[in-house]
Interface confidence: low
């Protein structure tokens, strides 16, 4: 009789087992939930990474969704050519052909009258003639001296295609669109049995106060840096070099008490643009003390060191750096695979299983 459990005791044991099972399941579920925070200065590629997650892990953009980006493609294209023409006045660059001055005026008129999401043959023709002009090209080649979308040449070189009446943006066209992120954009996807919640945050400083203090329980931070920004000035104050602005922000994130136990993944992005730029603009524009060669490998490695050296807890905190091109789906897929493996490894460490 001493060893016999009463019905009440049996029920209590079952309840206890069930609670343990639920706790274990909750723990496993929590371990499988990954909270990723995308940070970085304005126009560093954060939103492009989010778009890539949709393409890679969520079957991409439907035709209907692509159609909705048509107006953004046109707006980006028009803004780009207008920005170049504005800069010609400031930089005192003349049109190669004086007849283009009429086209420039016409551009303003047609752009002002354009219906959103439509590009008339007349407007396309004006843009095409302007883009071909030698003065416009000379000004484009000096784009480090003013603000110009990275996608300017991509769209302007492809005007024949995008100006077609039946034009539907491709996945790549969508990836290249530029819309300033305001507030916080959340995206969810599953990969390698992990449930990712990714938060894209507006990079401009005016947005930062919204997020700097409110992200507890973040698994990892992906910090994006535009490598190609080393020779540009910052859009918001026109004084501080964008790379230095980015380093200042990275310093504040990397050494922040809220992120002591958070993996920091550094995406040195826009490597394709950087590779082209470094041939023409020396790295000393940004780092006067730099004594290395202006080769992609050496200059990129130097920038990597500049960022990694900001880490004040090298003994306990590792920075996982990757060179990326956010508009290249294959590259992002490869890098994100490696990032996920790091997250899994660190998760196992935290659970005492590694």
């Amino acid at each position: 009789m001493g060893c016999t459990l009463s019905a009440e005791d049996k029920a209590a044991v079952e309840r206890s087992k069930m609670i343990d099972r639920n706790l274990r399941e909750d723990g496993e579920k929590a371990a499988r939930e990954v909270k990723l925070l995308l940070l970085g200065a304005g126009e560093s590629g954060k939103s492009t990474i989010v778009k890539q997650m949709k393409i890679i892990h969520e079957a991409g953009y439907s035709e209907e969704e692509c159609k909705q980006y048509k107006a953004v493609v046109y707006s980006n294209t028009i803004q780009s050519i207008i920005a170049i023409i504005r800069a010609m006045g400031r930089l005192k660059i003349d049109f190669g052909d004086s007849a283009r001055a009429d086209d420039a005026r016409q551009l303003f008129v047609l752009a002002g009258a354009a219906e959103e999401g439509f590009m008339t043959a007349e407007l396309a023709g004006v843009i095409k003639r302007l883009w071909k002009d030698s003065g416009v090209q000379a000004c484009f080649n000096r784009s480090r001296e003013y603000q110009l979308n990275d996608s300017a040449a991509y769209y302007l070189n492809d005007l024949d295609r995008i100006a077609q009446p039946n034009y539907i943006p491709t996945q790549q066209d969508v990836l290249r669109t530029r819309v300033k992120t305001t507030g916080i954009v959340e995206t969810h996807f599953t990969f390698k049995d992990l449930h990712f919640k990714m938060f894209d945050v507006g990079g401009q400083r005016s947005e930062r106060k919204k997020w700097i203090h409110c992200f507890e329980g973040v698994t990892a931070i992906i910090f994006c840096v535009a490598l190609s920004d080393y020779d540009l000035v910052l859009a918001e104050d026109e004084e501080m070099n964008r790379m230095h602005e980015s380093m200042k922000l990275f310093d504040s994130i990397c050494n922040n008490k809220w992120f002591t136990d958070t993996s920091i993944i550094l995406f040195l992005n826009k490597k394709d643009l950087f590779e082209e730029k470094i041939k023409k603009s020396p790295l000393t524009i940004c780092y006067p003390e730099y004594a290395g060669s202006n080769t992609y490998e050496e200059a990129a490695a130097y920038i990597q060191c500049q960022f990694e050296d900001l880490n004040k807890r090298k003994d306990t905190k590792e920075i996982y750096t990757h060179f990326t091109c956010a508009t290249d789906t294959k590259n992002v897929q490869f890098v994100f695979d490696a990032v996920t493996d790091v997250i899994i490894k660190n998760n196992l460490k935290d659970c005492g299983l590694f």
Epitope: I78, Q79, R86, R105, F108, V109, A111, G112
Partner: nanobody, 120 residues
Framework: EVQLVESGGGLVQPGGSLRLSCAAS????????MNWVRQAAGKGPEWVAS????????DYAHSVKGRFTVSRDNTKNTLYLQMNSLKPDDAAVYYC?????????????WGQGTQVTVSS
């Protein structure tokens, strides 16, 4: 509220002249460069001429250079377009508009227009 009111249009024979006026109100007129823009039936708008805020600099489309003269009177908040040697191709609705730099931002201010007909 910004208002631009054009007047002076009408029917004129080829080779004839017209003087268009644009009365501006609701903004500091002498802070703005101003423009004349026209739109012929079934065609897109076409920039015609512009004048700097204080009237020092003027600029014209090739098609009207030497025939049209843009001027302004900041004391009267009025913009003018003197059109000589008119051709059938000049027939259009003529609008005055604020500086092009505001147009692509969607803050363009255009008047209602005045019709110019050139016909014998």
């Amino acid at each position: 509220e910004v208002q631009l009111v054009e007047s002076g249009g009408g029917l004129v024979q080829p080779g004839g002249s017209l003087r268009l006026s644009c009365a501006a109100s609701g903004f500091t007129f002498d802070d703005y460069a101003m423009n004349w823009v026209r739109q012929a039936a079934g065609k897109g708008p076409e920039w015609v001429a512009s004048i700097s805020s204080r009237g020092i600099t003027t600029d014209y489309a090739h098609s009207v250079k030497g025939r049209f003269t843009v001027s302004r009177d900041n004391t009267k908040n009025t913009l003018y377009l003197q059109m000589n040697s008119l051709k059938p191709d000049d027939a259009a609705v003529y609008y005055c508009a604020t500086d092009p730099s505001t147009w692509y931002r969607g803050t363009a201010h255009w008047g209602q227009g005045t019709q110019v007909t050139v016909s014998s």
